[in-house]
């Protein structure tokens, strides 16, 4: 005999599980339909009636097939140091990421919970490791023969210009000054810039403290409880 297609709700066979997009309702002891993303279970199934689903209300969402009694609340609006990279819809939560010049000091499941400004290396120090979405800039002292005269999160240490005749020798925070005769070799004018990190999705990385840097100010964002996972098995 050909196998019959069971319509929800139905009693699963011994040792079997419910099919894709179904869940086992422990109260009804039946396989029942899940609700699609953007919906939630308004009425749970019984032995004689399937799950009744309803759309999520404004500012709430479900991202997965589910049987949650209420949709999850979207996260709070992005703070001033963040940009909204994904809007709150019925099917997805709002995602906030750090704006340019900032990095994620404390990530959450999606997006960033706490942004902090990228460290600026003061004169005499250059960028050893550039900032990323999730890590701060690392500064290093300019080695002999190099300098940085800026307070910057992107400038590296540059070689001193080489003079035929040196008027003022260079140091870690100042280029060499040549006499009026042209130098034999010089760097192109202007600071050398590293590319800014582009903030998208972030992971948690502790910022590396550097004693030789300007202080970094952090702004704490409101932290609510993480939303419950949709899925598994419910009443």
């Amino acid at each position: 005999l050909p196998a019959q297609v069971a319509f929800t709700p139905y009693a699963p066979e011994p040792g079997s599980t419910c099919r894709l997009r179904e869940y086992y309702d422990q109260t009804a002891q039946m396989c029942c339909s899940k609700c699609s993303p953007g919906q939630h279970a308004k009425v749970f199934c019984t032995k004689t009636s399937d799950t009744v689903c309803d759309s999520c209300e404004d500012s709430t969402y479900t991202q997965l097939w589910n049987w949650v009694p209420e949709c999850l609340s979207c996260g709070s609006r992005c703070s001033s140091d963040q940009v909204e990279t994904q809007a709150c819809t019925r099917e997805q939560n709002r995602i906030c990421t750090c704006r340019p010049g900032w990095y994620c000091a404390l990530s959450k499941q999606e997006g960033c919970r706490l942004c902090a400004p990228l460290r600026k290396c003061r004169p005499g120090f250059g960028v050893a490791r550039p900032g990323t979405e999730t890590s701060d800039v690392v500064c290093k002292p300019c080695a002999p023969g190099t300098f940085s005269n800026t307070t910057s999160s992107t400038d590296i240490c540059r070689p001193h210009q080489i003079c035929n005749v040196v008027a003022i020798p260079g140091n870690a925070s100042m280029d060499a000054v040549c006499t009026s005769t042209s130098p034999t070799r010089s760097m192109a004018p202007g600071a050398v810039h590293l590319p800014q990190p582009v903030s998208t999705r972030s992971q948690h990385t502790q910022p590396t403290p550097e004693p030789s840097t300007a202080p970094s100010t952090s702004f704490l964002l409101p932290m609510g409880p993480s939303p419950p996972a949709e899925g598994s098995t419910g009443d």
Epitope: A11, P12, Q26, Q29, K47, T48, S232, T233, G234, D235
Partner: antibody
Framework: QVQLVQSGSELKKPGASVKVSCKAS????????MSWVRQAPGQGLEWMGW????????HYAQGFTGRFVFSLDTSVSTAYLQISSLKAEDTAVYFC????????WGQGTLVTVSS | DIVLTQSPDSLAVSLGERATINCRAS??????????MHWYQQKPGQPPKLLIY???RLESGVPDRFSGSGSRTDFTLTISSLQAEDVAVYYC?????????FGGGTKVEIK
Amino acid sequence: QVQLVQSGSELKKPGASVKVSCKASGYTFTTFGMSWVRQAPGQGLEWMGWINTYSGVPHYAQGFTGRFVFSLDTSVSTAYLQISSLKAEDTAVYFCARRSNFAYWGQGTLVTVSS
Amino acid sequence: DIVLTQSPDSLAVSLGERATINCRASQTVDSSGNSFMHWYQQKPGQPPKLLIYLGNRLESGVPDRFSGSGSRTDFTLTISSLQAEDVAVYYCQQSNEDPWTFGGGTKVEIK
């Protein structure tokens, strides 16, 4: 395959407490509820109620409220039945049974209450 | 609560003969096209063993001499040709609504 393994026999004095365990294997523990069934010596089967293994919410049958407590440790896929203030009439074999309409059963735990 | 009344209380049948056990429910146990009536065999010192589920479906590994029939309130377990190892107590159980209830049991012996 589905297996429910219960703790061993217990001999208790009246007024004492007992905790029976039921360890599940061969399926996802939090998918199916767990029922408890009592069988007094020479008697039939009596359903005591069940616990939702996903939410942890217990549901007690009439006559099994108060002294009877269902609990879980999902980290070890185990359900528990605790009976307090034991009486001689609590002497019985206690079975755990997976709640899936028809039941898969543990081997049973004999609890004897005697002074 | 749904009351299940099993008959007879005990039954003595010759080896190779048919054994029939009845179970009557105080209200229907049918829903969604299924009969939520199940049959178990219990031997001394052992837990009940599922034989028939949802009225008439034979559990895997159970000999096909066992069969179940009926609907709504009246159900029957039949052993077509009794074997020595079938000596046991047989219970019906309903799961259409809580509380789960069991019949009082039927003891099957060899005549």
